[in-house]
């Protein structure tokens, strides 16, 4: 059994979250990947996803979220720029693998965004948008919609939940009432 774990990032408004999700490249290099938020009592909500099939090193931008999938390294880079307090929450990377349930990649990210400016003289924290210049050739991909056979009345698994794991990803087959992905044609 595998423990779902969380990693906390404490950031200020206007700053950027920059995380990397590690996956098994032989199995999932071209698979579609997504960035989701998990709110208590709700199904995970997909905020952004790569194209299908996922393109190597091709930035996908959805609002303030930028995804870049590096097939050669087995890495999905996720950036959330110009963070707002309302962005606080629990996030995860998943890999779509229809018709099977998606894989969730370690670790979940507990993002805490607070108001205020924590800059120091000489730092360029106030130039987040300059540091993160979004490439002009970004693409907005269509993400699979999540559906559920019944209303979710409980929160998704907490960080102590046990689920099975193949290789280096968590297989969510044991929580099918929480996550559903339609089969692609």
């Amino acid at each position: 059994a595998t423990k779902l774990t969380e990693e906390k990032y404490e950031l200020k408004e206007g700053q950027t979250l920059d995380v990397k999700c590690d996956y098994t490249l032989e199995k999932f290099a071209s698979s579609q990947k997504a960035w989701q938020i998990i709110r208590d009592g709700e199904m995970p909500k997909t905020l952004a996803c790569t194209e299908r099939p996922s393109k190597n090193s091709h930035p996908v931008q959805v609002g303030r979220i930028i995804l870049e999938d590096y097939h050669d390294h087995g890495l999905l880079r996720v950036r959330m720029v110009n963070l707002q307090v309302e962005d606080s929450g629990l996030y995860q990377c998943v890999i779509y693998q229809p018709p099977k349930e998606p894989h969730m990649l370690f670790d979940r990210i507990r993002l805490v965004v607070t108001k205020g400016f924590s800059g120091t003289p000489g730092s360029n924290e106030n130039s987040t948008q300059n540091v993160y210049k979004i490439p002009p050739t970004t693409t907005k991909a269509l993400c699979p919609l999540y559906t559920s056979p019944r209303t979710v009345t409980q929160a998704p698994p907490k960080s102590t939940a046990d689920v099975s794991t193949p290789d280096s990803e968590i297989n969510l087959t044991n929580v099918t009432d929480i996550i559903r992905v339609p089969v692609f044609n």
Partner: antibody, heavy 119, light 108 residues
């Protein structure tokens, strides 16, 4: 509790070989990349090698490329570093380190094992 | 390869005083920076990651700031157990991951 424990260090002659091992516990081993970081006596930290959670991706510092091989056995929760063609400059304490799940920093370190390359 | 430069090499501070350590990257690493503490004969210990976030169990007298190329580790009120060597490390993407040469914080 996350624990990593290195073994296999010792004295070896230049040109010789040595295999370091790291036993890990307290976390889902196959879900995390692992690394080796070394520290020469009285010097700073130097990243040596990293392997992804599945073992499918490996990285090496230029100073050890072609001489060192990193590997892992996820069924045994062990990490290895095979060191060949050793040089005096490889003398250092070698640390096994768990890579964080969200980025490439090192959130847990072993106590290190000393490798001395000398004739 | 990104070069990380720490300053000063040695910082002499009295207990209870504030210590400010600097780390500079040769190119922008955004917020992809970690700070470690190492005491003699011990392994390094993670203090700060993502430039600002304290690792589990790290006292709040330790704080990190900066982004891009300039970073700071601040120890607001030095305790006896804080005298050690501190290293910064970048992790912008894949390896090589480079460390600064370290700053030794010693008792004044």
């Amino acid at each position: 509790e996350v624990q990593v424990l290195e073994s296999g260090g010792g004295l070896v002659q230049p040109g010789g070989s040595l295999r370091l091992s790291c036993a890990a516990s307290g976390f889902t081993f196959n879900a995390y990349a692992m690394s080796w970081v070394r520290q020469a006596p009285g010097k700073g930290l130097e990243w040596v090698s990293t392997i992804s959670g599945s073992g499918s991706t490996t990285y090496y510092a230029d100073s050890v490329k072609g001489r060192f091989t990193i590997s892992r056995d996820n069924s045994k929760n062990t990490l290895d570093l095979q060191m060949n063609s050793l040089r005096a400059a490889d003398t250092a304490v070698y640390y096994c380190a768990k890579v964080a799940g969200s980025n490439f920093f090192f959130d847990h370190w072993g106590q290190g094992t000393l490798v001395t390359v000398s004739s | 390869e990104i070069v990380m430069t720490q300053s000063p090499a040695t910082l002499s501070v009295s207990p209870g005083e504030r210590a400010t350590l600097s780390c500079r990257a040769s190119q922008s690493i955004n917020s992809n920076l970690a700070w470690y503490q190492q005491k003699p004969g011990q392994a390094p210990r993670l203090l700060i990651y993502g430039a600002y976030t304290r690792a589990t169990g790290i006292p709040d007298r330790f704080s990190g700031s900066g982004s891009g190329t300039e970073f700071t580790l601040t120890i607001s009120s030095l305790q006896s157990e804080d005298f050690a060597v501190y290293y910064c490390q970048e992790f912008i993407m894949w390896p090589p991951y480079t460390f600064g040469q370290g700053t030794k914080v010693e008792i004044k």
